[in-house]
Every structure is written in structure tokens, then in C-alpha cells.
């Protein structure tokens, strides 16, 4: 049993039918010595009386609110959570597998640029009674600092019969140099919490890897005299880290007919225009990638070629 | 990529054109290290990240762009000095800090060399014949060191008398291909900001 | 007293369809993941399905993905397994499990493909 | 598509030290718990090992489990004729839990 925040209790069981449990001491928080008894959640039945209570945690039944009082007055609460191993593994019910980049991912985790700033996000389809808490640090054995502040619903979707519900969070390295390689990784904790289930979810990664740039802005198109060509022009998001000729970008320009099935022309390039020849009824996109460390592609910016 | 590309002009700055070479020859070797090595942690979640130049050249606080030495974070150590010579110093107007740059970036090149040679040495000792250091990625390296034209004391090959344990020589192997790519990234961005510049 | 009985099995042409039963008793069944595995005649034992406690995710191997589905009634305390066109190599013993460091197996059932 | 690899067969005299290895990867049991089973004839597997190298209560001392990187064994010293059986390791994979990776199964005889 271990102190999740004040009052609140972990108890970790193997987790398997007819298992035994654990033995778990609750002591009232209190001076008094006499005249104790103690109670669970909203049950008046007396469990028993002293100002320490021992009980066998062996199911969710077993977990709750306990209370202990005196002549009707509350002296003292201790709230235990349950937190299952499967044979040695810890359950992962309340959140999804999102399964990319690969199986098991339950936080995903990008960054638009160098700065060391950062938004996790995770899907569960439980609705109510489900707290989530996060923690972050650069490498685990000296921990740096990184804050993160609190865990937001960011989106409702619905999935066949299920609704499904993104949460995501925001941290900020503390002192982060852009121009900096990383040798230690930013490790990311969420603490989960549903009814009286705990579990605690992480994810480590390096920021060069999570690095995804905004799409490229101020997308716009100059046709050519006399020809089906068009110049199209771009320029870096703003959010992209400075300066550009240190972090620099490539591009992939795309040329898109309006069926899905139409021959896609592409061009890559570490300029920021192109020419290309606009089809009729066809879309002219860009997206960027960082032009030295392969990590992800931006989503596309696009301009119809009308 | 396989695809059409736009190439950049090579401009006025000799090593750019290096560099990128630099860090294709380095991120193919570290794919075909990860491919063929796939029952070792070769990954870059598996692997410790060490860097041999730690403490021996700083070339991310010597190469830092301009617009970054007001940020408090990115000013460690910037005490190291290096020589000073160096053809890649196209214009006059070149920086003292920049001489310094640029010789960090060589000695990051010559410390990278030796470790290569020395390891390639012990992957041809061994019999299952796995895997050996690209050459090209070792001419690239001698081609950008070339270019950088320092005069700086060779360093001699490390030679070892016991035998070769070969797990382990592949996993550092490992280790030292991504701290390279790594490196290799922070070179080519200087070089294209000095180009730029 | 952990049990499981299993029921179903029997002698099936290819093709055709079959649904095993394992009826648990002595635990608190809606708060355990279950496992289907299967044993062919003398050879190893080979995982089929998994299902949560609460029935919300289903796990396959590739081998029967797509022709099996594993179920379970949790108000009749049963796992059940689904299979729809069943071939020769799906003869096998099948047995039920718990889930967990100390689990607990059904006594089997035998399913014969053969026409 | 079995991915634990066991001896096909092993065997000793009585009083012995019997000895079955499981080799598996990284992904599975250089990262995940092993367990071991033994399968008398015509009957459903009975759980040896659990966690390495616990035992549950009711198994014999002399049945013992160890985990070393992306190996784990499995020891009967002083075995006996009731031993004479199929013992199989399993373990998960991180990428396919819960899935059941089983060894390939390991025929102890007797002599």
C-alpha cells in the first residue's frame, strides 16, 4: 500500500480468482484513543471499532471511503484504490490502446518545435467518475524539471456504438535550449483514476522525435504567363523554432485531382515555393518536415488550383 | 527519398554540401545497423545515449546561432577554445566564435573516425561476419574533415590485445551511429546557418 | 472453490459452425479476463481469444481471426466461443483459463473437423 | 509461429536434476514474467511456476523456476516417475499481450 495524495491510498493486488488479498492497517488520524468505530462510504454498518482497523483487500468491494468517527462526529477519512496486476503485468482498462506508432501506446505525444514544449493526449470511452493527474521530467534517475499543467477533455467522438473521449495535456520544459541534443528522454506520467480503479500510464521520448511542424502558412498561387504552370509559394508556421536556417524545413508539394483515385504529382523541395502545373479541378497542398531529423510530417496546407 | 527533389544551390559555403552527404551516409548506416542487428538493442529506446565528445569539444555551445545566446538555457559551457584556421571560413567577416565552431566540429569528426576505425577493425575479427562500417560513411567523414582543412595532431588508432567481445562491439556500435546521426543533424544546421549567414 | 465446466464440443463437417460454452462458478466471474486455448492432437498448446472482465476488448490470433468470436454473459457467469467455418487444423482440445499469475483451467472439450 | 523455443525432449533418472530452457526475445521474456506448466496425459495444464520463479502452494520444492535476459529454465531436481510428462513455458509479447505466447513444449521421460 503506498500514499497516492493526502488520504487517498493505493492497494496493489495479484490479481486472479480466489486470490487472497492484501492485509491493509487503516489508523484514525486522530488523538483520541477510545470510543472509535469505523465505516465504509456511505454504509452505516460498523466494521469494527479502535483506532486502527485491519481488513482483507481482496476486491473492489473491499476498496472505498473509510471513515472513522466518535459519537456521530467524522474524525478522519482514508480512501483506498485498487490497482491490478495480471500476472504481472498492470491492467491498462480505463484507457485506450491507440496502437501507432505501435501497440500498447496509451499516450501519444507531439511538439510543434524545438522549444520544449509539448501535448499529450489519450482516449478512454468512460465518461464519469475519472480523474486524471500528470507528471513529467527530463530522464528519470536526476529528474529536470518539466511542468505540465492539468488534464483537459480536448474532444468527443463517436465510434460505432462507443463514445470516445480525448484528453490531453500540455508541459513546458523548464529550461530548454532548441539547438540542444537530447541524451536523456522527457519522461511522461498520468495517474488514472476511475471509481476505485487506479492505474498509472508513461511514455518516454526524446523531442526530436515527437516533432510534428504546424502546416506551412500563407500558401498562395502566381500563375505564369502563357503557361499551365503556377508558382505556388509557402512560408515557415509560425510556430516553427528560429532561426530558419538553423532549423530548417523541406517540403512536400502535392498536386491533387478532385477523385481521390487521380495520379498524385509530388515534388519535394527545401525552398519555399515550387512550380507546378495546375490541373483543372485539382488542389495544390504542402506540408513540412524538419529538413535534417526525420520525424513526422505536418499535416497539409492546401489552395485550390481555380 | 526516391522522389523528385529541388536541390538547394550549394552557395558560397563549401562544407554544406559535406555535411548533408554526411548525414545521409550516417542515417543509412543506421538503418542498415538496425535492420541487420535486429536481435540487439540497437533502437534508439533501447540503447544508452552517450556522447564520446562530452567534455572534449562543445560544439553545440560554440556553434550556437546568434539569435540563441539570449536564451539562459542554451549557455552551459562556451569556455572550450580551438584552433583557428580553417577553409571553410569563406569570408573575413567570419567570427572568432565561428573558428571555434568549426574546429569543435573537426574534432567531433576526428574523435568519430578513430571510434569507427577502431570498432571496424573488430567487426572483420569477427566470424559470423555480421556487419562492418559502411566505407562511404568513412570517406564522407574524411571529405568533410578535408574540407574543414584544420591542422590538429592525429590521434592514433586504439589497438586492443584481448580478444573482441562481439555482442558487445555491436551494441556499441549501435550507441555510437545514433549519437553520430545526432551530431551529424547539429552539423548540418550549422552548416546551413552559416551558409545562410 | 474455483471451477470451470466446459460444454459444446462434438464432430463437425468443414465448413460448419460450433459454440462452446464454459460455465464458471466460485468466483466473482465479471471481474476477470478469460483466455481460450486450444491443443491439437499431439502437439502444443496454442492460444486463441482473450476477453476483458467487461467484455469491452476482444483479442484473436491470426489463425482463427475473423471466424471466431469470443463472448461472454456475465449476469450467467458463461464464456462462450463462436466458430463459424471451421477447418480440418481447428481440431483440437479447447480449454477455458482465467486470467492471472495463478489461473485456472476448464477441463477441456473436444472439437473434430472432419467430413 | 511458436516464438519460445523448449528442447522437444529432456530426460533423467530418478533422484536427477532435470533441466528445460525457454528462449525467447527482447519483446517477450526479457520484458514480461514467465510461467511454467506441466501436462499429464489426457488432462488440462497444471501451473509449476509463476512469476520466474514462484510457486504456488501445493507444487513440490523441487520444481523451481529461473529468469535470466530473454531466457528462462525450469528445474525438477530429484525427479520422480509422477514427473514424467509435457512442460511447457509461457510468457507475453509487449506487442501482442494478452495473447498467450506458449514454448514449444519440452517431453520429460523418466528412466
Known amino acids: 500500500i503506498w500514499e497516492l495524495k493526502k488520504d487517498v491510498y493505493v492497494v496493489e493486488l495479484d490479481w486472479y480468482p480466489d486470490a487472497p488479498g492484501e492485509m491493509v492497517v487503516l489508523t484514525c488520524d486522530t488523538p483520541e484513543e477510545d470510543g472509535i468505530t469505523w465505516t465504509l462510504d456511505q454504509s452505516s454498518e460498523v466494521l469494527g471499532s479502535g483506532k486502527t482497523l485491519t481488513i482483507q483487500v481482496k476486491e473492489f468491494g473491499d476498496a472505498g471511503q473509510y471513515t472513522c468517527h466518535k459519537g456521530g462526529e467524522v474524525l478522519s477519512h482514508s480512501l483506498l484504490l485498487l490497482h491490478k496486476k495480471e500476472d504481472g503485468i498492470w491492467s491498462t482498462d480505463i484507457l485506450k490502446d491507440q496502437k501507432e506508432p505501435k501497440n500498447k501506446t496509451f499516450l501519444r505525444c507531439e511538439a510543434k518545435n524545438y522549444s520544449g514544449r509539448f501535448t499529450c493526449w489519450w482516449l478512454t470511452t468512460i465518461s464519469t467518475d475519472l480523474t486524471f493527474s500528470v507528471k513529467s521530467s527530463r530522464g528519470s534517475s536526476d529528474p529536470q524539471g518539466v511542468t505540465c499543467g492539468a488534464a483537459t477533455l480536448s474532444a468527443e467522438r463517436v465510434r460505432g456504438d462507443n463514445k470516445e473521449y480525448e484528453y490531453s495535456v500540455e508541459c513546458q520544459e523548464d529550461s530548454a535550449c532548441p539547438a540542444a541534443e537530447e541524451s536523456l528522454p522527457i519522461e511522461v506520467m498520468v495517474d488514472a483514476v476511475h471509481k476505485l480503479k487506479y492505474e498509472n500510464y508513461t511514455s518516454s521520448f526524446f523531442i526530436r522525435d515527437i516533432i510534428k511542424p504546424d502546416p506551412p502558412k500563407n500558401l498562395q498561387l502566381k500563375p505564369l504567363k502563357n503557361s499551365r504552370q503556377v508558382e505556388v509559394s509557402w512560408e515557415y508556421p509560425d510556430t516553427w523554432s528560429t532561426p530558419h536556417s538553423y532549423f530548417s524545413l523541406t517540403f512536400c508539394v502535392q498536386v491533387q485531382g478532385k477523385s481521390k483515385r487521380e495520379k498524385k504529382d509530388r515534388v519535394f523541395t527545401d525552398k519555399t515555393s515550387a512550380t507546378v502545373i495546375c490541373r483543372k479541378n485539382a488542389s495544390i497542398s504542402v506540408r513540412a518536415q524538419d529538413r535534417y531529423y526525420s520525424s513526422s510530417w505536418s499535416e497539409w496546407a492546401s489552395v485550390p488550383c481555380s | 527519398r526516391n522522389l523528385p527533389v529541388a536541390t538547394p544551390d550549394p552557395g558560397m559555403f563549401p562544407c554544406l554540401h559535406h555535411s548533408q552527404n554526411l548525414l545521409r551516409a550516417v542515417s543509412n548506416m543506421l538503418q542498415k545497423a538496425r535492420q541487420t542487428l535486429e536481435f540487439y538493442p540497437c533502437t534508439s529506446e533501447e540503447i544508452d545515449h552517450e556522447d564520446i565528445t562530452k567534455d572534449k569539444t562543445s560544439t553545440v555551445e560554440a556553434c550556437l546561432p546568434l539569435e540563441l545566446t539570449k536564451n539562459e538555457s542554451c549557455l552551459n559551457s562556451r569556455e572550450t577554445s580551438f584552433i583557428t584556421n580553417g577553409s571553410c571560413l569563406a569570408s573575413r567577416k567570419t567570427s572568432f566564435m565561428m573558428a571555434l565552431c568549426l574546429s569543435s566540429i573537426y574534432e567531433d569528426l576526428k574523435m568519430y573516425q578513430v571510434e569507427f576505425k577502431t570498432m571496424n577493425a573488430k567487426l572483420l575479427m569477427d566470424p559470423k561476419r555480421q556487419i562492418f562500417l559502411d566505407q562511404n560513411m568513412l570517406a564522407v567523414i574524411d571529405e568533410l574533415m578535408q574540407a574543414l582543412n584544420f591542422n590538429s595532431e592525429t590521434v592514433p588508432q586504439k589497438s586492443s590485445l584481448e580478444e573482441p567481445d562481439f555482442y558487445k562491439t555491436k551494441i556499441k556500435l549501435c550507441i555510437l551511429l545514433h549519437a553520430f546521426r545526432i551530431r551529424a543533424v547539429t552539423i548540418d544546421r550549422v552548416m546551413s546557418y552559416l551558409n545562410a549567414s | 472453490q474455483v471451477q470451470l465446466v466446459q460444454s459444446g464440443g462434438g464432430v463437425v463437417q468443414p465448413g460448419r459452425s460450433l459454440r462452446l460454452s464454459c460455465a464458471a462458478s466460485g468466483f466473482t466471474f465479471s471481474s476477470y479476463g478469460m483466455h481460450w486455448v486450444r491443443q491439437a492432437p499431439g502437439k502444443g498448446l496454442e492460444w486463441v481469444a482473450f476477453?476483458?472482465?467487461?467484455?469491452?476488448?476482444?483479442y484473436y490470433a491470426d489463425s482463427v481471426k475473423g471466424r471466431f468470436t469470443i463472448s461472454r454473459d456475465n449476469s450467467k457467469n458463461t464464456l462462450y466461443l463462436q466458430m463459424k467455418s471451421l477447418r480440418a487444423e481447428d481440431t483440437a482440445v479447447y480449454y477455458c483459463?482465467?486470467?492471472?499469475?495463478?489461473?485456472?483451467w476448464g477441463q477441456g472439450t473436444m472439437v473434430t473437423v472432419s467430413s | 509461429s511458436y516464438v519460445l523455443t523448449q528442447p522437444p525432449s529432456v530426460s533423467g533418472t530418478p533422484g536427477q536434476r532435470v533441466t528445460i530452457s525457454c528462449s525467447g526475445g527482447r519483446s517477450n521474456i526479457g520484458r514480461n514474467t514467465v510461467k511454467w506448466y506441466q501436462q499429464l496425459p489426457g488432462t488440462a495444464p497444471k501451473l509449476l511456476i509463476y512469476g520466474n520463479d514462484q510457486r504456488p502452494s501445493g507444487v513440490p520444492d523441487r520444481f523451481s523456476g529461473s529468469k535470466s535476459g530473454t531466457s528462462a529454465s525450469l528445474a525438477i531436481t530429484g525427479v520422480q516417475a509422477e514427473d514424467e510428462a509435457d512442460y511447457y513455458c509461457?510468457?507475453?509479447?509487449?506487442?501482442?499481450?494478452?495473447?498467450?505466447?506458449f514454448g514449444t513444449g519440452t517431453k520429460v521421460t523418466v528412466l
Open positions: 509461457q510468457s507475453y509479447d509487449r506487442g501482442t499481450h494478452p495473447a498467450l505466447l
Open positions: 483459463k482465467t486470467h492471472g499469475s495463478h489461473d485456472n
Open positions: 476477453i476483458r472482465y467487461d467484455g469491452s476488448n476482444k
